[in-house]
Interface confidence: low
């Protein structure tokens, strides 16, 4: 027989010879990092037909690292489902917990023993320090010193000393989040008051009031013979200004001798040619808008509210 077969997990005991006599036996041992589990044979014999009797390295098993339990409030996930050397163990903490230590450990061979590259991490509960205090306001649970994951606090504004109230700007509720950080910045409390919105040749159709505080919403329509230049709905923003700006009602001009451009009967926000009704800026039209069923325009001899689509 020629040289005996070679294997990934086991190696020949002694030096190989160029050839072997019939009946001659060779023995193998498990390589470093592998261990033998009986009963499979780890030897072979040169057979009468000049071939080696079948043998495999199935009896040699890769050294495995010690079993790692799931950390408390977390999970240990073998990266490819095995504890054998050369592979990784990933650690994940359950929601509401964070990892202290290495996120990945490696199963390494030290001498002939497989050991983990480090100490398994632990999962600690996510805790937050008290949320910020705000001027002219307060939050719930102000006496609590430590907050747990997803614990929430709600802010409210103090009564104002003057005639106008403090408005809460931002989200009133925040919660203790993933990285021991509050979910968002604390809101603020301040007086927000927008000027009375006057639209000549038009009128409010919703949001009536004498004073307009934060988030007050007003909707307008134009008198007959006028069209809206700007947005029909405006909101009082945190800077005490209307957003978008207060619209104008512009006079519909008499028809010119030239034919007006055709307007589609369906409104699309992606339309490149905007009608005057949807135009917030740009040159004023010099033609009379058509008096069709185009949304936002009155039909002949009808009030605007009747024709709103």
């Amino acid at each position: 027989c020629e040289e005996p077969p070679t294997f990934e997990a086991m190696e020949l005991i002694g030096k190989p010879k160029p050839y072997y006599e019939i009946g001659e036996r060779v023995d193998y041992k498990c390589k470093k990092g592998y261990f033998y589990i009986p009963p499979l044979a780890t030897h072979t014999i040169c057979d009468r037909n000049h071939t080696w009797l079948p043998v495999s390295d199935d009896a040699c098993y890769r050294e495995t690292c010690p079993y790692i339990r799931d950390p408390l409030n977390g999970q240990a996930v073998p990266a490819n489902g095995t504890y054998e050397f050369g592979y990784q163990m990933h650690f994940i903490c359950n929601e509401g917990y964070y990892l202290i230590g290495e996120e990945i450990l490696y199963c390494e061979l030290k001498g002939s023993v497989a050991i983990w590259s480090g100490k398994p991490p632990i999962c600690e509960k996510v805790l937050c320090t008290p949320p910020p205090k705000i001027k002219n306001g307060k939050h719930t649970f102000s006496e609590v010193e430590v907050f747990e994951y997803l614990d929430a606090v709600t802010y409210s504004c103090d009564p104002a000393p003057g005639p106008d109230p403090f408005s809460l700007i931002g989200e009133s509720t925040i919660y203790c989040g993933d990285n021991s950080v509050w979910s968002r910045a604390a809101p603020e409390c301040k007086v927000v008051k927008c000027r009375f919105p006057v639209v000549e040749n038009g009128k409010q159709i919703s949001g009536f009031g004498k004073k307009f505080y934060y988030k007050a919403t007003v909707m307008f329509e134009c008198d007959k013979g006028f069209y809206l230049d700007g947005s029909d709905t405006i909101v009082c923003d945190s800077n005490s200004t209307w957003d978008p700006p207060v619209p104008k009602c512009l006079k519909v001009l008499p028809p010119s001798s030239t034919k007006p451009p055709a307007l589609s009967h369906s409104v699309s926000t992606s339309s490149t040619t905007k009608s005057p009704a949807s135009s917030a800026s740009g040159p004023r039209p010099t033609y009379k808008p058509p008096v069709s069923n185009y949304p936002g325009y009155p039909k002949p001899e009808e009030g605007i509210l009747d024709s709103l689509d």
């Epitope: 799931d70 240990a76 489902g81 095995t82 994940i92 929601e95």
Partner: antibody
Framework: QVQLVQSGGGVVQPGRSLRLACAAS????????MHWVRQAPGKGLEWVAV????????YYADSVKGRFTISRDNSKNTLYLQMNSLRAEDTAVYYC?????????WGRGTLVTVSS | QSVLTQPPSVSGAPGQRVTISCTGS?????????VHWYQQLPGTAPKLLIY???NRPSGVPDRFSGSKSGTSASLAITGLQAEDEADYYC?????????FGGGTKLTVL
């Protein structure tokens, strides 16, 4: 509220494809290993596939290897199971489940019927 | 044929104690992998009952307990109640594969 909402089941012919979805709320799927488990009518549970928390490792049961693909879209917080070359024996209720070694949260399941 | 073997059915009268066995091999339970138990009430999704051999998730009554020894594990239910009637599955792991037992139907007489 922590839950898994499943969609995408239905009746399909052998050899055709189907995609199941599992939308998570109350937690983020990319913090956890996520699994698909199925249950044929009147039978027991059979594990189908898993995707590791980082998405780099995917494992499949031998019965679906090469035909099914597990994936997820972190921006949509959703887990998917793309099922190709479906066979009659794939008929089952498919559950998505959260967790590594064990499944601590399950979807309600979606029925997939493979029939000509 | 499931790799983890469970009895197809067990039964008991209200108030009694029943156990459900789960037998594996040296490549799964015997290799040190944890055993978990799930309860599946009729027409519903499975629910985690015991994890890591003997731990109960919050909300699971202490009438349910788990144990593991060698290549097998068992689930014990004491003070049996009518609402415990369900299918019970054990689960473990082997290289790259999550395993389930064939399931045991518990009947409360």
């Amino acid at each position: 509220q922590v839950q898994l909402v499943q969609s995408g089941g239905g009746v399909v012919q052998p050899g055709r494809s189907l995609r199941l979805a599992c939308a998570a709320s109350g937690f983020t799927v990319n913090n956890y290993a996520m699994h698909w488990v199925r249950q044929a009518p009147g039978k027991g549970l059979e594990w189908v596939a898993v995707i590791s928390y980082d998405g780099n490792n995917k494992y499949y049961a031998d019965s679906v290897k090469g035909r099914f693909t597990i994936s997820r879209d972190n921006s949509k917080n959703t887990l998917y199971l793309q099922m190709n070359s479906l066979r009659a024996e794939d008929t089952a209720v498919y559950y998505c489940a959260k967790g590594g070694g064990y499944f601590d949260l399950w979807g309600r399941g979606t029925l997939v019927t493979v029939s000509s | 044929q499931s790799v983890l073997t469970q009895p197809p059915s067990v039964s008991g009268a209200p108030g009694q104690r029943v156990t459900i066995s789960c037998t594996g091999s040296s490549s799964n339970i015997g290799a040190g992998y944890d055993v978990h138990w799930y309860q599946q009430l009729p027409g519903t999704a499975p629910k985690l009952l015991i994890y890591g051999n003997n731990n109960r998730p919050s909300g699971v009554p202490d009438r349910f307990s788990g144990s593991k020894s060698g290549t097998s594990a068992s689930l014990a239910i004491t003070g049996l109640q009518a609402e415990d009637e369900a299918d019970y599955y054990c689960s473990s792991y082997t290289s790259g594969t999550w395993l389930f037992g064939g399931g045991t139907k518990l009947t409360v007489l």
